[in-house]
C-alpha cells in the first residue's frame, strides 16, 4: 500500500470479522423488526478512483469507531468478555498500523482533504449508530442489528483496501 | 454477476426422502440468508423457512417446521431443503431466495429459478 | 403471525391504465419493511419494491411503493404489456415472514 503497513493487516481484518461474527448472542432472525437504515456512505468505499490517503483513512476512522462503540459499559454489559477483549487488542494493533502508514502517506504530501473528509462522513455515520443504540435502549436485538450493519460497513472497508492492494500490485508488475 | 442456481426437477413417490439444492455465486455466500418459498399449482407464494449459511441457524414457518429441513454448507455456497418423507401435497415448485439478514437491504432481491418437485404414486 | 391480505384478488386493466394494488397487514409493521414482487407465468417472483417505497435497481420507473403502519399501495403509473403478471406483497417485519394471497393484473 506504498507504506510499510505489514501484511497481516488484510488478516488482522479478516480476524476482526471473524470475532465479531462469533460475538453474536441471539438470533437474529428475532431481530428483524429492529432492522434500520443507518446509511452506510457506500460512495466512500465504492470508488474505481482511489488514493491511498482516502483508504487509510477510512480504515483508520471505521475501526476507530468500532473500537469506541465495543469499549463502552453499555458494550461490556451487552457481550462475552473474552471475545471483546480479543477484538479491542486486535482493533489496537489495526489502528497502531494505519496510525503509522497515515503519517507517512501525509509525510508524501497527500491531500489532508482525502483524510479529513471521509472522517467526517463516518462520524455521522456512527452518531447514528448510537443513536439508535439509545433510542432501543440497548436492547439486544438493537446491539445485533448494530453488529451485523458494523460487519457490512467492515466488509466493504477492507474489500476497499483490497481493490487498492491489487491496483499496486499491477502497477508494480506492469 | 449474482446467481443462484437450483438442482432439476424431481418425480418422486409418496414416502420417499428428497433434497433439493440451491448454489449461490456472485456473491459473499456468508454475508446473505437463504430463504426457501413453495408455491403450489395455480397458488401463491408461501415462505418456508430461511438460514444464515454462516452458522446454518435457522428459522421455520410454523406450517414447515418439522415438515422440511434446511440446510447449508458455506463451503461449496449451498443450500438444501429436504424432506425425509413426501406426500403427494408437497407437490409445487419451490424456490430460494437471498435475504440481506438485518441489514437495511432489498428481501429476496435474487431468486433461483426453481424447483418442481412432484409427487405421485 | 402477521397476515397479509390483498386487493383486489384480480383486476382488468388496458395498457396505459394506471393501476393500483392495496396490501393490509393485520398488525402494524412499524419500520415499514414491506416488499412487493412481480410474478410472470413458469418464472420465479422479481422484487419490484422495498421497504415499502424504495424502488429495487432496474425496476422501471412507472412501479412506486407507498404506506405506512397497516397500509400499503403498489402503483403502476401507465400499465405496460410486461406488466401483465401476478403482485405479491410481502412483510419482512417479523417471522414467519408472510405474502399476500396475490393479485393477478390481466388484459381488458
Known amino acids: 500500500l506504498g507504506c510499510d503497513l505489514p501484511q497481516n493487516h488484510g488478516l488482522l481484518s479478516r480476524n476482526t470479522l471473524v470475532l465479531l461474527h462469533q460475538m453474536r448472542r441471539i438470533s437474529p432472525f428475532l431481530c428483524l423488526k429492529d432492522r434500520r437504515d443507518f446509511r452506510f456512505p457506500q460512495e466512500m468505499v465504492k470508488g474505481s478512483q482511489l488514493q491511498k490517503a482516502h483508504v487509510m483513512s477510512v480504515l483508520h476512522e471505521m475501526l476507530q469507531q468500532i473500537f469506541s462503540l465495543f469499549h463502552t459499559e453499555r458494550s461490556s454489559a451487552a457481550w462475552n468478555m473474552t471475545l471483546l477483549d480479543q477484538l479491542h487488542t486486535g482493533l489496537h494493533q489495526q489502528l497502531q498500523h494505519l496510525e503509522t502508514c497515515l503519517l507517512q502517506v501525509v509525510g508524501e504530501g497527500e491531500s489532508a482533504g482525502a483524510i479529513s473528509s471521509p472522517a467526517l462522513t463516518l462520524r455521522r455515520y456512527f452518531q447514528g449508530i448510537r443513536v439508535y443504540l439509545k433510542e432501543k435502549k440497548y436492547s439486544d436485538c438493537a446491539w445485533e442489528v448494530v453488529r451485523m450493519e458494523i460487519m457490512k460497513s467492515l466488509f466493504l472497508s477492507t474489500n476497499m483496501q483490497e481493490r487498492l492492494r491489487s491496483k499496486d500490485r499491477d502497477l508494480g508488475s506492469s | 454477476e449474482v446467481q443462484l442456481v437450483q438442482s432439476g426437477a424431481e418425480v418422486k413417490k409418496p414416502g420417499e426422502s428428497l433434497k433439493i439444492s440451491c448454489k449461490g455465486s456472485?456473491?459473499?455466500?456468508?454475508?446473505?440468508?437463504i430463504g426457501w418459498v413453495r408455491q403450489m399449482p395455480g397458488k401463491g407464494l408461501e415462505w418456508m423457512g430461511i438460514i444464515d449459511p454462516s452458522d446454518s441457524d435457522t428459522a421455520y414457518s410454523p406450517s414447515f417446521q418439522g415438515q422440511v429441513t434446511i440446510s447449508a454448507d458455506k463451503s461449496i455456497s449451498t443450500a438444501y431443503l429436504q424432506w425425509s418423507s413426501l406426500k403427494a401435497s408437497d407437490t409445487a415448485m419451490y424456490y430460494c431466495a437471498r435475504h440481506p439478514g438485518l441489514n437495511w437491504a432489498p428481501d429476496f432481491d435474487y431468486w433461483g429459478q426453481g424447483t418442481l418437485v412432484t409427487v405421485s404414486s | 403471525d402477521i397476515q397479509m391480505t390483498q386487493s383486489p384478488s384480480s383486476l382488468s386493466a388496458s395498457v396505459g391504465d394506471r393501476v393500483t394494488i392495496t396490501c393490509r397487514a393485520s398488525q402494524s409493521i412499524r419500520n415499514n419493511y414491506l416488499n412487493w414482487y412481480q410474478q410472470k407465468p413458469g418464472k420465479a417472483p422479481k422484487l419490484l419494491i422495498y421497504a415499502a417505497s424504495s424502488l429495487q435497481s432496474g425496476v422501471p420507473s412507472r412501479f412506486s411503493g407507498s404506506g405506512s403502519g397497516t397500509d400499503f399501495t403498489l402503483t403502476i403509473s401507465s400499465l405496460q404489456p410486461e406488466d401483465f403478471a401476478t403482485y405479491y406483497c410481502?412483510?419482512?417485519?417479523?417471522?414467519?415472514?408472510?405474502f399476500g394471497q396475490g393479485t393477478k393484473v390481466e388484459i381488458k
Open positions: 456472485g456473491y459473499s455466500f456468508t454475508s446473505y440468508w
Open positions: 410481502q412483510q419482512g417485519y417479523d417471522t414467519p415472514l408472510t
